[in-house]
Interface confidence: medium
């Protein structure tokens, strides 16, 4: 098919970075300013993406590849190819319609993006809370109470006595 196409279609000889210009008897012309073609044989060049506002340029547009954007400090990318920028929050917060809000008791977020997630329920695995959870950190589960009984062998050494941790109901 490719061979047939190249015999019949002069545009197939136009490399990436050019377009097949019908106004010039189908000869290859360079992509105009602010445009690109990533494959050969194209009849038009695509307009380069503009990284404006909250977007900033990560990679400049070239004659053969589109510009790539990321987000200005204080924002992070969402969607394929960083199609959106979303505001960062602090660790221990999540973004709501009303802005950044602290995580509710029993939940945490250890990143500047995403939602608050429930603390791990250690008791579901038959374990106890070794380190309490906070808004920024999940609880750390320790050995099960049975592992701490006299004579039981445990990989994890017994934890020092401490306040019992909170785990979500």
């Amino acid at each position: 098919f490719e061979r047939t196409r190249s015999l019949q279609d002069p545009c197939s000889n136009c490399p990436a970075g050019t377009f097949c210009d019908n106004n010039r008897n189908q000869i290859c012309s360079p992509c105009p300013p602010n445009s690109f073609s990533s494959a050969g044989g194209q009849r038009t060049c695509d307009i380069c993406r503009q990284c404006k506002g909250v977007f900033r340029t990560r990679k400049e547009c070239s004659s053969t590849s589109n510009a790539e954007c990321d987000c200005t400090p204080g924002f992070h990318c969402l969607g394929a190819g960083c199609s959106m920028c979303e505001q960062d929050c602090k660790q221990g917060q999540e973004l709501t319609k009303k802005g950044c809000k602290d995580c509710c008791f029993g939940t945490f977020n250890d990143q500047k993006r995403g939602i608050c997630r429930p603390w791990t329920n250690c008791s579901l695995d038959g374990k106890s809370v070794l380190v309490n959870g906070t808004k920024e950190r999940d609880v750390v589960c320790g050995p099960s109470p049975a592992d701490l009984s006299p004579g039981a062998s445990s990989v994890t050494p017994p934890a020092p006595a401490r306040e019992p941790g909170h785990s979500p109901q």
Epitope: G17, N23, C28, P30, N34, S62, S63, T64, S65
Partner: antibody
Framework: EVQLVQSGAEVKKPGASVKVSCKAS????????THWVRQAPGQGLEWMGI????????SYAQKFQGRVTMTRDTSTSTVYMELSSLRSEDTAVYYC?????????????WGQGTMVTVSS | QSALTQPASVSGSPGQSITISCTGT?????????VSWYQQHPGKAPKLMIY???KRPSGVSTRFSGSKSGNTASLTISGLQAEDEADYYC???????????FGGGTKVTVL
């Protein structure tokens, strides 16, 4: 007769900006792209960027991204090149050049050049 | 983005032929037939001598010819004349974000 007439010589201090103009005549202004090329004293030619006078779209050389702005005024058939945050290395003759028909691969007419000196 | 590579100088006697090379990569000279050559006399603006590798603008002497092989383009001046003494620059379209690149220039001296 095709002509590209550029503005006069400029002397600027480091950190300042300069705006060079290039007035076209003798052809349909919006049908031909305009390149900007510079030449430091005793050095070679350096491509800076290109503007489509019809739509105003631009492509700049990576070296000048963020410092150069090319604009046009179709009512006066004039193209402008503004370079900001000037440093001594920007001392050069700045040329505008008409892209050959239909944005071919070359520049067939050139302005006379504008000498820009950056000195404290 | 480094410039295309040209010899710093080439010389010849009147009537001789000389060739100036312009070496790039497959991303510029080798990838496209968009190579042009410019002549520049001291204190003057450049003048287009060859475009699209081998095409001559009207008004340019037939003594000037261009060609390309692989990643190297060449400008040949036959029947060298005193007025050919000048700097010559090649220029190519490129896949980089710097769309057009010049060579470093070649000083042609007529002995």
């Amino acid at each position: 007769e095709v002509q590209l007439v550029q503005s006069g010589a400029e002397v600027k201090k480091p950190g300042a900006s300069v705006k060079v103009s290039c007035k076209a005549s003798g052809y349909t202004f919006t049908s031909y792209y305009t390149h900007w090329v510079r030449q430091a004293p005793g050095q070679g030619l350096e491509w800076m960027g290109i503007i489509n006078p019809s739509g105003g779209s631009t492509s700049y050389a990576q070296k000048f991204q963020g410092r150069v702005t090319m604009t046009r005024d179709t009512s006066t058939s004039t193209v402008y090149m503004e370079l900001s945050s000037l440093r001594s290395e920007d001392t050069a003759v700045y040329y505008c050049a008409r892209g050959a028909p239909e944005y071919s691969s070359s520049s067939d007419y050139w302005g006379q050049g504008t000498m820009v000196t950056v000195s404290s | 983005q480094s410039a295309l590579t040209q010899p710093a100088s080439v010389s010849g006697s009147p009537g001789q032929s000389i060739t100036i090379s312009c070496t790039g990569t497959s991303s510029d000279v080798g990838g496209y037939n968009f190579v042009s050559w410019y002549q520049q006399h001291p204190g003057k603006a450049p003048k287009l001598m060859i475009y699209d590798v081998s095409k001559r603008p009207s008004g340019v002497s037939t003594r000037f010819s261009g060609s390309k092989s692989g990643n190297t383009a060449s400008l040949t001046i036959s029947g060298l004349q005193a007025e050919d003494e000048a700097d010559y620059y090649c220029n190519s379209y490129t896949t980089s974000s710097t769309r057009w690149m010049f060579g470093g220039g070649t000083k042609v001296t007529v002995l």
